[in-house]
């Protein structure tokens, strides 16, 4: 009989094509507990039976099947905090980053039907339970109601609300975006008994109008009110109702403290404290101002007092307050501490504890490292992230403090865990910590465990992405590597994804993938099959991200680095790699190029138009090109304002427009898409205005009606087929 | 002691205006919503207006465009300016504390008459 | 609006006896926002239901509330003779709240 012919396993492997990485062949799952106590939790199975879970019996059982699920077409539910009634949220419409629309059903769990009678108006433009039994809080047509059970008729607490006006429970556009994060802006208080709200008025704000195609005669016209950097912003005003008897008070309006409502200013976030306490942050209009405000309901004057003494400010001398966002207080069971990460004296990231006042703070971490976020406080322990382990910034790990000892003492919880696979992870928590999940995003695959609070032991793998792995077994990927350049004073860390057979000794085109915008972090040992994993796999390409000044977690001289200049260190510092890069002696200098979306759209713009001749070819997608034409919290966090008293000259500086003599000697490809509604369709405009009347030849494309994300599917396919032949073409690799 | 005295009542021509005033005292003024109730001779209670405790307005269809009711929270007193007065306008007018119900103090009262 | 419907009209009495007053709305009013209200000849209304059920504070506790979405009761348990007045049911469910026309409680 013949000798069986062995093949070595590598030949067996296939790069990865285009066709995958469209098709989301190779994506990955998280498992995160829908927790709705110490020790159960919900989740939606594969095949949408809502499963109830029992940590400590062992017990599980559908809880709403799938039959129910689809008799709405519901593709999500919320379970009502005395388990009477679930919410099926149907006819998902997006609207901005967060925002959607819903159509939603109110399921008796008692009873096996439906609630009828009262049925919830739609589109709802948000929907949530009370902590505590079932009242419902919704938002329809910029109004407040309040139901005080599925059942009954609503109560309608806000009638200001008004379409492209004024907003009551929702964000506006930049606040949506820029500021809260979140669809919503409103908030229980623990007991359910009162309901804050924010109320933004737009009225004065200038309307950003831009055409939407769709299939009709004539287009469309969307109207956003939108401040760009200098524009009249939102006007805000902070409420709060008595849930019990809203029809008796009426909604009380809660005081800006007098420091921030001097001048122009934001509101920033809501916390609750206690049932009759809260927690408010104010910010400046000039962003390096905060004050925390602590308020009490007054029973005597019903009304909600926050005294002087309770203001709590933070200021940054360097650059802005916070990193992204300025962080939120967890507090401690006193309700009246709390812990909170700001900037220490050195300019790194830390916890702190406030007693009585910021001057008076207690630092509790503290390292050329910093704590990124407080996941939860509880009686004894304190867990939180950080990149404090080995000095990588791009790690994630969990760590709780001890903080019933003295001095507290500090565990990483998931450092040695799978220390190979496992060096970003973030976490959910059941109420008190009893348990957690902790999802782990790389370097290797994702993985979801669930965890013991007090001992921190492994019970149950969540999801552990078997497919997956199975799938990937007979993949040729690239090899990742994250190190550090230095540069005279200056440390950057990068990503390189080399092709598979990388050989040092010979000569690989260079794409550098740049985002790079202020408080961001491209830099991550996190797990990902994409575009750019492709382009090294089957084309061949190394792949390089750096993050340079400006970006995230390395302390506030790097991160302010920046500061009221955009435009000028990202860019250098991208160059810088490069130079870096091509010494180290495997890259074709002939061919480099370098792309980004977005923020990283400007920057890569900026770096085809430096002049340097390092840069064979590149590509913007929907790029800034002015910081005047986006919205004037974020431009003005990081500039300052667009007057001449203030920082016009470097707005006009920093254009893309002033540089479109310098694309002469690059192949420059622009897209953008006609409906982007955060980046707006008007810098890419300018951008090709500019390069005709300097007589620049580029290519461009438009995706018609998408936005920001470019995200329908065949737009997508389009997209990276698109970019993917520009590069082969400028790369000169064969088809 | 929570007391709340109406004034600004009498005898006016229709097509004339009063202005009610509403003097509180025994409570937090300014932390409160209130509103004006009415009542014809010999006949039910009619809610008319009413107003937030941070300025927002309410009022019955009946009245709205004619009647505008006001609150100055550093003197405790609410206010309703009653402008076109009709005779159906007739009525004893209270000021209550509370917005939509729960109108848990009144006045005592007092009267409008619309007649030529 | 929601029309509130009070009945009977006028309840004739005796002190000591029960007083049952009804109020029905033309649509559902949840419990949160119904309240009863008592108007002596010459006086301001006084609040003593809030909530369908709860006595308003220094109210006897011989007045007491019932009822839910459409039907609403007040019953005086036992009637003492500061009781005989107008009573008026209100919601505060919707914008413009409205009252019942009242319902008068007499000495037989």
């Known amino acids: 009989r013949p000798s069986r012919v062995y093949k070595p396993e590598g030949n067996t492997k296939r790069a990865l094509t285009l066709k995958d990485i469209l098709n989301g062949t190779f994506s990955y799952k998280t498992y995160f507990p829908n927790w709705i106590s110490e020790q159960e939790y919900l989740h939606q199975s594969e095949d949408d039976n809502i499963v109830f879970y029992n940590i400590e019996t062992r017990e599980s059982y559908i809880i709403l099947s799938n039959s129910t699920m689809k008799s709405v077409n519901a593709t999500d539910y919320g379970l009502s905090p005395d388990r009477q009634f679930v919410y099926l949220e149907s006819d998902y419409s997006k609207l901005w980053r967060y925002s959607y629309t819903a159509t939603y059903y109110i399921y008796d769990l008692q009873n096996g039907e439906f609630v009828r009678g009262y049925e919830l108006p739609r589109p709802i433009q948000y929907l949530c339970w009370s902590p505590v039994g079932s009242k419902l809080a919704y938002v329809y047509q910029n109004n407040i109601y309040l139901k005080q059970r599925p059942g009954d008729p609503p109560f309608q607490i806000t009638y200001t609300g008004r379409e492209n006006r004024i907003f009551n429970g929702i964000p506006d556009w930049v606040y949506e975006e820029e500021m809260l994060a979140t669809k919503y802006a409103l908030w229980w208080s623990p007991d359910g008994k009162f309901l804050a709200y924010v109320e933004f008025n737009d009225s004065d704000i200038p309307i950003i109008a831009y055409s939407y195609y769709g299939d009709g005669q004539y287009p469309r016209t969307i109207n956003i009110p939108y401040p760009k950097a200098g524009a009249k912003n939102p006007v805000v005003r902070v409420f709060i109702v008595d849930t019990t008897y809203p029809h008796h008070v009426g909604p009380m309006e809660v005081p800006v403290p007098e420091m921030i409502a001097s001048s122009d200013y934001y509101f920033s976030w809501l916390t609750w404290v206690s049932s009759e306490r809260v927690c408010l942050q104010w910010l400046k209009r000039v962003q390096n101002v905060s004050v925390l405000s602590i308020c009490d309901f007054r029973e005597d004057w019903h009304a909600w007092e926050c005294p002087k003494n309770q203001e709590h400010v933070e200021e940054s001398r360097t650059g802005w307050a916070g990193g992204f966002f300025v962080s939120t207080p967890a507090f401690s069971q006193d309700a009246t501490s709390y812990y909170k990460i700001f900037s220490d004296k050195d300019g790194y990231k830390h916890i702190h504890y406030i007693k009585d006042t910021v001057e008076n703070a207690i630092q509790i971490t503290s390292g050329k490292w910093e704590a990124i976020y407080i996941f939860r406080v509880t009686q004894d322990s304190l867990f939180y992230s950080s990149n404090e382990f080995e000095g990588y910034p791009g790690r994630r790990n969990i760590y709780r403090i001890s903080i019933g000892n003295s001095p507290p003492s500090k565990k990483c919880v998931t450092c040695h865990l799978r220390k190979e696979r496992c060096q970003y992870y973030t976490a959910s928590f059941s109420y008190k910590a009893k348990y957690y999940a902790l999802v782990c995003y790389g370097p290797g695959l994702p993985i979801s465990t669930l965890h013991d609070g007090r001992t921190d032991q492994e019970i149950q793998v969540l999801e552990e992405n078997k497919e997956l792995e199975n799938s990937l077994r007979n993949i040729q990927l690239p090899k990742v590597e994250i190190k550090k350049l230095k540069d005279g004073g200056l440390t950057f860390w990068y990503k390189m994804i080399l092709p598979p057979q990388f050989d040092r000794s010979k000569k690989y085109p260079l794409l550098i993938q740049v985002y790079g915008g202020p408080c961001s972090q491209s830099v991550k040992s996190v797990f990902a099959v994409n575009w750019i994993t492709y382009l090294a796999s089957k084309e061949g390409i190394v792949i390089a991200l750096v993050d340079g000044r400006g970006t995230a977690f390395q302390g506030d001289k790097f991160l302010h680095a920046v500061y009221r200049k955009l435009g000028v260190y990202e860019v250098e510092d991208q160059l810088t790699a490069v130079r870096k890069f091509i010494e180290m002696g495997f890259i074709d200098e002939e061919r480099i190029a370098i792309w980004g979306w977005s923020y990283g759209g400007y920057v890569s713009s900026l770096a085809l138009a430096s002049g340097t001749g390092l840069f064979k070819c590149g590509i913007a997608v929907a790029p800034v090109s002015s910081w005047e034409y986006y919205a004037s919290i974020y431009s003005e966090r990081f500039m300052g304002l667009p007057t001449k008293d203030d920082n016009l000259e470097h707005y006009k500086n920093s254009t893309v427009m002033a540089r479109a003599e310098y694309f002469r000697n690059v192949d420059y490809l622009l897209i953008h898409g006609t409906a982007d509604d955060n980046v707006h369709f008007q810098n890419s405009a300018q951008i090709a205005k500019a390069l005709v009347n300097a007589q620049v030849d580029f290519q461009a494309m438009w995706y018609s009606d998408q936005n920001h994300g470019i995200l329908s599917g065949r737009s997508q396919n389009h997209l990276y087929t698109h970019m993917t032949h520009f590069l082969k073409q400028c790369f000169s690799l064969s088809d | 002691e929570v007391q709340l005295l109406e004034s600004g009542g009498g005898l006016v021509q229709p097509g004339g205006s009063l202005r009610l005033s509403c003097a509180a005292s025994?409570?937090?003024?300014?932390?409160?919503?209130m509103s004006w109730v009415r009542q014809a001779p010999g006949k039910g209670l009619e809610w008319v207006s009413a107003i937030w405790a941070s300025g927002e307005q309410y009022y019955a269809d009946s009245v709205k465009g004619r009647f505008t009711i006001s609150r100055d929270n550093s003197k405790n007193t609410l206010y309703l300016q009653m402008n076109s007065l009709r005779a159906e306008d007739t009525a004893v007018y209270y000021c209550?504390?509370?917005?939509?119900?729960?109108?848990?103090?009144w006045g005592q009262g007092t009267l409008v008459t619309v007649s030529s | 609006e929601i029309v509130l419907t009070q009945s009977p009209g006028t309840l004739s009495l005796s002190p000591g006896e029960r007083a049952t007053l009804s109020c029905r709305a033309s649509q559902s009013v949840s419990r949160s926002y119904l309240a009863w209200y008592q108007q002596k000849p010459g006086q301001a209304p006084r609040l003593l239901i809030i909530g369908a059920s709860t006595r308003a504070t220094g109210i006897p506790d011989r007045f007491s509330g019932s009822g839910s979405g459409t039907d609403f009761t007040l019953t005086i348990s036992r009637l003492e003779p500061e009781d005989f007045a107008v009573y008026y049911c209100?919601?505060?469910?919707?914008?413009?709240?409205?009252f019942g026309q009242g319902t008068k409680v007499e000495i037989k």
């Open positions: 209550a504390k509370g917005w939509l119900g729960n109108f848990d103090y």
């Open positions: 025994g409570f937090t003024f300014s932390s409160h919503a």
């Open positions: 209100q919601q505060g469910q919707v914008i413009p709240p409205t």
